[in-house]
Structure formats: structure tokens, C-alpha cells
């Protein structure tokens, strides 16, 4: 399995690899092979990253930030091919490499620009700050900065919040958008230029369900063709709200199958989920039971929220007792 | 084609100094090691010392440590010998020669016609 | 250090012969030897490295062999232009030169 980092060529010798926050790279050189061959890689013309002559490493002044993170295709040496496979790359590894090559027949250097990108998951949460409600789109650590955008009904929203907060490698943002009192759809895109990836959320209020006390009640909840895609792992959540928080109902993982359901009154139909319907029921429903119940989907690249007003009333039997 | 020139040779007192300097043409200067090596009249070869393509590494031959050091500006494609505290035992002609390539080899592919230095009072 | 013994220090040969010039480390240096022909007045000049390669433009009358403490510079058939000093040098730990063999006419 090769290092997940892909390569932009561009003239003068020069090459762009981009690489993920702590994961392994390659960055390529090659040269006309020939024998004696002589490699030096060099970070910002200055740090020595790795030496080989004489058939073997020499690492006596290897700049220690490279320590047991950098080898060489030995096997390929002979075949023309310097690269250098790095490991756990950092934001602080961004930079100029280069590559010398001597043999016997000739000196080459090639220069390897080495871009790192961070996109750790974002999240899209739902939250109630005393009388108002939020969306929130959120990404713990991302680099570079990414581009955030909203739409409402499809339409794109010129306001769009964000608080930032920069850590040493990376960025944390939250973009909240105040949805208080709106039965709109929203959408949330958070893209990562660099690393070519976007993640989406989606937020869908359904119509309000009134229900008698004992009743039952079955609520939706289907993917959206366009972000869904079944071979991809991801996660599905149903929870309730209560004062403010929600309480996880029962949750489904893809990749294992597995269904975890915590509250006993609780069915999810298994033919149902096979074609990816996670529609649930709720079982013999009390007064408290009102509220609003959230079905989260979420994968590496997207979060599908649709949240559901459960208002529980009374039956007119328990009404008359009254 | 490739050549060496070497400059600044004499005869000089000991305990004195004096630097020798070599002009290198015909290849890229920035993407080779260079050597200085030198001869005893009338006896064998003598490695002196190393320096780098790129000027991290310098290495000296022990009869010369401390005394000597080897230095490069690849902006003027030139190598020098800065000689502190000649003594007679110095007195020999020293070469300038080019490594096969960075210096990691170190054997002399390339030498330029030497430089005579005389120490004596 | 390594300290690299040549012999003979002088070797009587005519045209047409084959020569044989040894050189001996003091310590193991792998195939890290290179051989340089110098003649009287003259800078040296590289005639074969990592003990048997020989360098781009020399003769292929001259040959190298050996691997870690012995080691043999051969000349097939001698040409008057090859009567000269040849000098033995380990390149494995820094450097150091053999005293030499002066290759002279019988």
C-alpha cells in the first residue's frame, strides 16, 4: 500500500508532493542509473534528511528531526530511483527538499516542494442556547484554512460566522449560523483546497408529529443519494433531546453491522437498514417522550442531520382520570 | 573540459600563513567535492583535505589539524587553503582535485597542476 | 588509520610485458581503492576506481582487482607511454596513498 500523498510535476526538476498530517509520504527522484551513486537529501538547503554512499546510509549528521523517520528504495538504487519514503509527516516538514544524485556518469539534483494538509472529520452539531438554535459546523484540526460555505433551501448565505482558533500546526473552526424559528433545510461545506477534499452537512427539520400518549410513532430517516454512498463506512445515531442535551437513543456502525439501541422502546427494522432506511419506531410513548429526536449519518465525508418535534399529548382516557 | 587552476604558492617563514586558492571551470563547482592533495619533492602523495559540494563537511588528514582549513565560495567557483603555522615539513606541491562527486566518495577524478610552497626561513 | 603498502617500490619492465603492481591495507576497505598513473612533473591521474572500474578514456591494457586488504593494478602489455609512478589509494575511511611504485624501462 503506497503512502497516501499524490505528486504535481512541474518544470525545472521540480515536483509537488502533498501529504496528510501525520501519515507517510514518498518523495520522488530519479536519476540515469550509473554505479557509485551518491544520494543526499537536503531540507531548505540547509538540514541534512539523509545520506547514502558507499552502499550504505550514513547518518552521522542527520538533522535529528529526521531521526527514524527516512529510508530509501534500496532495492531500486540500482535501478535509478532516490526517492525517499518519509514517515508521520508534520505541518513543520513543509518545505524545499533536494535531491543529489552522483554517480559515475553524473550529477543531478531535483527539488521536491512537500505541502501538508490536516482535515481531521468535521462535525456538524445541533444546539440550543436558551431560547435560540444553532447549527454548527465545526472542524477540530484543519490545514490550510479552509473554505467554509452555507446554503439555506439550496441558496447560498453571505453570512457565515467563524471562529478560529490557531494552534502551532493547525487551525480549529467553528461557523455557527442561527437557525432559531426556521423549518428551512441547511447545508454546510467545509473544503480543504489542498488536500482536494470537502465534507458536507446537512441539516433537515421534518413537520412536527402529535402523538396520544401509548401511541406509537415511526420517524424517517434516509440518506440523501448525493452524499450517500453505501460502500463508504459511517455511522448512524438516533438521540433525544432533553433540558438542552441530547441522550443517544441507539446507534448503527456500517462497518461492523452492529445495532446498540439503549432504550428498550426503541426498534429499528433490520430489512429496512439493509436498504439503507434507518427509519426507527418508538414504542408505547409517555408525556415526557416530547421533543426533539435528531438522526445523525455521518461518514469521512459528510453528516446528514434530520431532526424530528415529537409533541406527546395526553390521551383523552388519561385526560377524563384527570 | 574540466579544469583547476591553483594560485598563491611561495616561499614563506615558518610559523607563517598563506592561502592558497583554486579556480575551478568547465563543470558545475556547487554540485562537486573538492580536494586538496599534496606532494614532498621527490616523494609520494599526501592527502590533505575535503570539503563538500555544499560546504557541510570538511575533513582534515591529522599532520594538518588545527593548522589548516578548507573553505569554498561556490558563487566564484572557488576553492582555497588557508595554511597557519607552516613549518618546514609543509613544503611540497599541493593540487587541487575534484571528488567524483559530492565528497562522500573521496577519491580525485579531476586535479589541477599544482601550487609550490616553500617553507623556509 | 589505514595505512596502504605498495610493491614493489620500483618495477624494471620492457614494451610488450604484462606488470603486476600490488597494494596491501592495513585494515579491510571493501572494494574503496582507486588507482592514479603520475608522470614526473605531472599532476596524477585516475586510472581505475572502487578497485576494478575502470575511468572513461583510459586504455583497457590496464586492469584492477581485489577486495578488502589485497589488491592489484595490471597492465597487459606495456606501451612506452605507461613508464611512470603509480599510486594505490583506499578511499574507505577518509584517505590514504601507497608510497608508490615507479614503473621504469629495463
Known amino acids: 500500500i503506497f503512502p497516501l500523498a499524490f505528486f504535481i510535476y512541474v518544470p525545472m526538476n521540480e515536483q509537488i508532493v502533498i501529504g496528510r498530517l501525520d501519515e507517510d509520504i514518498i518523495l520522488p527522484s530519479s536519476f540515469e542509473r550509473g554505479s557509485e551513486v551518491v544520494i543526499h537529501w537536503k531540507y531548505q538547503d540547509s538540514y541534512k534528511v539523509h545520506s547514502y554512499y558507499k552502499g550504505s546510509d550514513h547518518l552521522e549528521s542527520q538533522d535529528p528531526r529526521y531521526a527514524n523517520r527516512t529510508s530509501l528504495f534500496y532495492n531500486e538504487i540500482q535501478n535509478g530511483n532516490a526517492s525517499l519514503f518519509f514517515r508521520r509527516v508534520s505541518l513543520l516538514d513543509e518545505g524545499i527538499y533536494t535531491c543529489y544524485v552522483g554517480t559515475a556518469i553524473q550529477v543531478i539534483t531535483n527539488k521536491v516542494v512537500l505541502k501538508v494538509g490536516v482535515f481531521l472529520t468535521p462535525v456538524m452539531k445541533y444546539e440550543k442556547r436558551n431560547t435560540n438554535s444553532f447549527l454548527i459546523c465545526s472542524v477540530l484540526s484543519v490545514y490550510p484554512r479552509p473554505i467554509i460555505t452555507w446554503k439555506m433551501d439550496n441558496t447560498p448565505i453571505s453570512e457565515n460566522n467563524m471562529e478560529e482558533t490557531g494552534s502551532l500546526d493547525s487551525f480549529s473552526i467553528n461557523s455557527p449560523l442561527n437557525i432559531t424559528g426556521s423549518n428551512s433545510s441547511y447545508e454546510c461545506t467545509i473544503e480543504n483546497s489542498l488536500l482536494k477534499q470537502t465534507w458536507t452537512g446537512r441539516w433537515t427539520m421534518k413537520d412536527g408529529l402529535h402523538k396520544m400518549q401509548s401511541e406509537h410513532v415511526s420517524l424517517s430517516c434516509q440518506p440523501v443519494n448525493d452524499y450517500f454512498s453505501p460502500n463508504q463506512d459511517f455511522k448512524v445515531t438516533w438521540s433525544r433531546m432533553k433540558s438542552g442535551t441530547f441522550s443517544v437513543l441507539a446507534y448503527y456502525l456500517s462497518s461492523s453491522q452492529n445495532t446498540i439501541i439503549n432504550e428498550s422502546r426503541f426498534s429499528w427494522n433490520k430489512e429496512l437498514i439493509n436498504q439503507s432506511d434507518f427509519s426507527m419506531n418508538l414504542m408505547d410513548l409517555n408525556l415526557s417522550d416530547s421533543g426533539e429526536y435528531l438522526c445523525n449519518i455521518s461518514s469521512d465525508e459528510y453528516t446528514l442531520l434530520t431532526i424530528h418535534t415529537v409533541h406527546v399529548e395526553p390521551s383523552q382516557e388519561t385526560a377524563s382520570h384527570n | 573540459q574540466v579544469q583547476l587552476v591553483e594560485s598563491g604558492g611561495g616561499v614563506v617563514q615558518p610559523g607563517r600563513s598563506l592561502r592558497l586558492s583554486c579556480a575551478a571551470s568547465?563543470?558545475?563547482?556547487?554540485?562537486?567535492?573538492m580536494h586538496w592533495v599534496r606532494q614532498a619533492p621527490g616523494k609520494g602523495l599526501e592527502w590533505v583535505a575535503i570539503?563538500?559540494?555544499?560546504?557541510?563537511?570538511?575533513y582534515y588528514a591529522d599532520s594538518v589539524k588545527g593548522r589548516f582549513t578548507i573553505s569554498r565560495d561556490n558563487s566564484k567557483n572557488t576553492l582555497y587553503l588557508q595554511m597557519n603555522s607552516l613549518r618546514a615539513e609543509d613544503t611540497a606541491v599541493y593540487y587541487c582535485?575534484?571528488?567524483?562527486?559530492?565528497?562522500?566518495?573521496?577519491?580525485?577524478?579531476?586535479w589541477g597542476q599544482g601550487t609550490l610552497v616553500t617553507v623556509s626561513s | 588509520d589505514i595505512q596502504m603498502t605498495q610493491s614493489p617500490s620500483t618495477l624494471s619492465a620492457s614494451v610488450g610485458d604484462r606488470v603486476t603492481i600490488t597494494c596491501r591495507a592495513s585494515q579491510s576497505i571493501s572494494s574503496w581503492l582507486a588507482w592514479y598513473q603520475q608522470k614526473p612533473g605531472k599532476a596524477p591521474k585516475l586510472l581505475i576506481y572502487?578497485?576494478?572500474s575502470l575511468e572513461s578514456g583510459v586504455p583497457s591494457r590496464f586492469s584492477g582487482s581485489g577486495s578488502g586488504t589485497e589488491f592489484t593494478l595490471t597492465i597487459s602489455s606495456l606501451q612506452p607511454d605507461d613508464f611512470a609512478t603509480y599510486y594505490c589509494q583506499q578511499y574507505n575511511s577518509y584517505s590514504t596513498f601507497g608510497q608508490g611504485t615507479k614503473l621504469e624501462i629495463k
Open positions: 568547465g563543470f558545475t563547482f556547487s554540485d562537486y567535492g
Open positions: 582535485a575534484r571528488d567524483r562527486s559530492s565528497g562522500a566518495l573521496g577519491y580525485f577524478q579531476h
Open positions: 570539503i563538500w559540494y555544499d560546504g557541510s563537511n570538511k
Open positions: 572502487k578497485a576494478s
